[in-house]
Amino acid sequence: KKEDGESTAPTARPKVLRCKCHHHCPEDSVNNICSTDGYCFTMIEEDDSGTPVVTSGCLGLEGSDFQCRDTPIPHQRRSIECCTERNECNKDLHPTLPPLKDRDFVDGPIHHK
């Protein structure tokens, strides 16, 4: 998913990508930065009391196509967006919770920015 005005010229993805991490920082992360061969993500979830919880981190390349798609979960709301174009790109991701009682979102496209 490209932002308005963003260049369509291909950009070489860093071999090792650095991402901001919050609640999903591995043991070896420093200053809330993790490293990956895959994607950075930002995720929003709704807790039991209905409060939105925003977290972020690194996704390995293996299986990231599944992670970066909004896969359905029962009775709760969750949305995730992924990016690869530059280090710490997930600082600029702002996923929103899907509408209540609307499961249409779950089969939507993979969210890449």
Partner: antibody
Framework: QVQLQQPGAELVKPGASVKLSCKAS????????MHWVKQRPGQGLEWIGM????????NYNESFKSKATLTVDKSSSTAYMQLSSLTSEDSAVYYC?????????????????WGQGTILTVSS | DIQMTQTTSSLSASLGDRVTISCRAS??????LNWYQQKPDGTIKFLIY???RLHSGVPSRFSGSGSGTDYSLTIRNLEQEDIATYFC?????????FGGGTKLEIK
């Protein structure tokens, strides 16, 4: 790649307790629910419960609430299940399984990566 | 608890066949139905989630369908490596529950 390592077998006496381990590697341990599943010889699969390594939050199958206790050690990326007051009914293969989806507070129901299982034998 | 029923406990088929394994839930599970393969050595693999989505690395000869309470797993062009026991699992409501399994054998 994702790996879940479990000991092959444990032999325990009736009435005792045992702590089964599941060492995770190849992913960020704290980001995914870990599930535990029981399989008695020649039988189907029973979900015991799940634990989120980051928060320590758990959900148990009522049938196992007085039998199983789930814990994690984040520093070694290891999940544990303690089974207490063991009887022959507890003799089974116990599997740990990592969920498919990254989660922080939501509960996710997809057992995507499985350990090889630990054969628990309860016998005097 | 939601009961999951796999009425066929064992099934014989020939290599190259198309095989369908069915699973029924005791109540509507809103497509939160997953399929697993257990090999004779005990190894368990995740095949299909949310009724019809293939997990990574699963051959495209596997497919899933269904809705409400009735679901099925289909294997096209059965191969020797598909000989295993297949379990369905509902993920709609805690506690998660599994079907009793369908053992697939070669004729």
């Amino acid at each position: 790649q994702v790996q879940l390592q479990q000991p092959g077998a444990e032999l325990v006496k009736p009435g005792a307790s045992v702590k089964l381990s599941c060492k995770a590697s190849g992913y960020t341990f704290i980001s995914y629910w870990m599930h535990w599943v029981k399989q008695r010889p020649g039988q189907g699969l029973e979900w015991i419960g799940m634990i989120h390594p980051n928060s320590g939050s758990t959900n148990y199958n009522e049938s196992f609430k007085s039998k199983a206790t789930l814990t994690v050690d984040k520093s070694s990326s290891t999940a544990y299940m303690q089974l207490s007051s063991l009887t022959s009914e507890d003799s089974a293969v116990y599997y740990c399984a990592r969920d498919l989806l990254i989660a922080t507070v939501v509960v996710t129901p997809y057992f995507a990566y499985w350990g090889q299982g630990t054969i628990l034998t309860v016998s005097s | 608890d939601i009961q999951m029923t796999q009425t066929t406990s064992s099934l014989s088929a020939s290599l190259g066949d198309r095989v369908t394994i069915s699973c029924r839930a005791s109540q509507d599970i809103s497509n939160f139905l997953n399929w697993y393969q257990q090999k004779p050595d005990g190894t368990i693999k995740f095949l299909i989630y949310y009724t019809s989505r293939l997990h990574s690395g699963v051959p495209s000869r596997f497919s899933g369908s269904g809705s409400g309470t009735d679901y099925s797993l289909t294997i096209r062009n059965l191969e020797q490596e598909d000989i295993a026991t297949y379990f369905c699992q509902q993920g709609n409501t805690l506690p998660y529950t599994f079907g009793g399994g369908t053992k697939l054998e070669i004729k």
